[in-house]
């Protein structure tokens, strides 16, 4: 039951995280005009990964897309790439994890396959979360650098004649959404990896042992590990030494290397 809960919770947390990463990537408020210690303007500037916007006091908002690709700063391109990679990995991870969920039955898929899929999706979520955190952090670092550069030079001369107020930008809401979302995706991924350990058998399954009452011969029957309907069916390493015949399912266990008949 604990494994199911961990896997389910990991999936939900990752789902929320990836939704947050997508939201952050699409948001326009990656950087917003710094209003502290600035001349009070009747326009408010903010920028995203894909476009920059200006909200006027009149209530009108005008957004312009970055239609150039080559003219954009390399750092912005890198952030875009990191966020997209994060989204793609996260989306694939979600798809994989849906089939890996123990509560969903797909044909006769074995638990070992589900365990592998859970681990795969977990790793994908971890990488996705790291990509988002890295992307947001790179952008934040870029902002901090530019902020102090513009603070040192609040008023820049345009052609030595015109005094233009340098617009300083600070952290926008998207950065915080991205950090939180990346963190959630990372946590979800870790939870999936933990759940994988509970799903997978500790060792390769040996053949089930079957005793027959009629004689003293020992029969080794093929059987292997069968997928059970319950989550973590808590089968202990118990031996049955009575002479009665047992079905494979009854004696199904995880034998250790030293379990000899």
């Amino acid at each position: 039951m604990a494994v199911t809960a961990c896997q389910g919770l990991g999936f939900v947390v990752s789902l929320i995280g990836i939704a947050g990463i997508i939201a952050a990537t699409c948001m326009d408020q990656w950087s917003t005009q710094d209003l502290y210690n600035n001349p009070v303007t009747a326009v408010f500037n903010y920028q995203g990964l894909w476009r920059s916007c200006v909200r006027e006091s009149s209530g009108f908002t005008e957004c312009r897309g970055y239609f150039t690709l080559l003219g954009l700063p390399a750092m912005l391109q890198a952030v875009r790439a990191l966020m997209i990679v994060g989204i793609v990995l996260g989306a694939i991870g979600l798809l994989v994890s849906i089939f890996a969920l123990k509560c969903i039955r797909i044909g006769s898929m074995e638990d070992s396959a589900k365990a592998n899929m859970t681990l795969t999706s977990g790793i994908m979520f971890i990488v996705s979360g790291l990509c988002a955190i890295a992307g947001v952090s790179v952008f934040a670092n870029m902002l901090v650098t530019n902020f102090w550069m513009s603070t040192a030079n609040m008023y820049t001369g345009m052609g030595g004649m015109v005094q233009t107020v340098q617009t300083r930008y600070t952290f926008g809401a998207a950065l915080f959404v991205g950090w939180v979302a990346g963190g959630l995706t990372l946590i979800g991924g870790v939870m999936m990896c933990i759940a994988c350990r509970g799903l997978a058998p500790e060792e390769t399954n040996y053949k089930a042992v079957s005793y027959h009452a009629s004689g003293h011969s020992v029969a080794y029957k093929p059987g292997g590990f069968k997928a059970s309907t319950g989550f973590g069916s808590n089968t202990k390493n118990k031996k049955i030494y009575d002479g009665g015949a047992r079905t494979e399912d009854e004696v199904q266990s995880y034998p250790s290397k030293h379990d000899y008949v």
Epitope: Q33, V40, A42, Y46, Q47, Q163, T164
Partner: antibody, heavy 118, light 113 residues
Framework: QVQLQQSGAELVKPGTSVKLSCKAS????????LNWVRQRPKQGLEWIGW????????NYNEKFQGQATLTTDKSSSTAYMQLSRLTSEDSAVYFC???????????WGQGTLVTVSA | DIVMTQSPSSLTVTAGEKVTMSCKSS????????????LTWYQQKPGRPPKLLIY???TRESGVPDRFTGSGSGTDFTLTISSVQAEDLAVYYC?????????FGAGTKLEIK
């Protein structure tokens, strides 16, 4: 069509208050901000402040802070400006005007003449 | 506060003539976010409220004759009337729409001979 209808002329005594109204019609009242502008006799224009009827958000020119109070009544699509502690210097025509692109003012009321005299 | 200086304070022209009037601001009205200049031009005829002519320094309001042209950037702006008509007799004001408080120039009075 868009119209801003302002209240009639006022003759008031120094030290008293006056409340001017500006009734909007022909557009969604809560969507656009309304500005108030003063024009003293034979003088230029002075911006007093603006109010957004939608959320009641206001912004005042510091010069008029404390003296002018902007309010709206959404049910009647009317904006109000209360002027307190009036002096002869406040004798002017007061306009209400609607915000537009570039923070410009594209529709204006006809103006209300306020005369402050003992 | 941002000071808007208009010149000349008045000018007299004959109908059909080209007129230019200037407006200078004490600080740049150019917004780096959208590269627009937040300057507006109004026309006020005697006994009437002001009428919007130009916003964003050069965008003509709909219904305004194309003889009115706004130009300039940063701190220096110009309103040009290519061929003055008798009905253009008015006071022309420029307004800073970028910094609070939003300030107006003292106006340029246009008179027709």
């Amino acid at each position: 069509q868009v119209q801003l209808q302002q209240s009639g002329a006022e003759l008031v005594k120094p030290g008293t208050s006056v409340k001017l109204s500006c009734k909007a019609s022909g557009y969604s009242f809560t969507t656009y901000g309304l500005n108030w502008v003063r024009q003293r006799p034979k003088q230029g224009l002075e911006w007093i402040g603006w109010i957004f009827p939608g959320d009641g958000n206001v912004n005042y020119n510091e010069k008029f802070q404390g003296q002018a109070t902007l309010t709206t009544d959404k049910s009647s699509s009317t904006a109000y400006m209360q002027l307190s502690r009036l002096t002869s210097e406040d004798s002017a025509v007061y306009f209400c005007a609607r915000f537009y692109y570039g923070n410009s003012l594209n529709y204006w009321g006809q103006g209300t003449l306020v005369t402050v005299s003992a | 506060d941002i000071v808007m200086t208009q010149s000349p304070s008045s000018l007299t022209v004959t109908a059909g003539e080209k007129v230019t009037m200037s407006c200078k601001s004490s600080q740049s009205l150019l917004n780096s976010g959208n590269l627009r200049n937040y300057l507006t031009w109004y026309q006020q005829k005697p006994g009437r409220p002001p009428k919007l002519l130009i916003y964003w320094a050069s965008t003509r309001e709909s219904g305004v004759p194309d003889r009115f042209t706004g130009s300039g950037s940063g701190t220096d702006f110009t309103l040009t009337i290519s061929s003055v008509q008798a009905e253009d007799l008015a006071v022309y004001y420029c307004q800073n729409n970028y910094f609070y408080p939003l300030t107006f120039g003292a106006g340029t009075k246009l008179e027709i001979k």
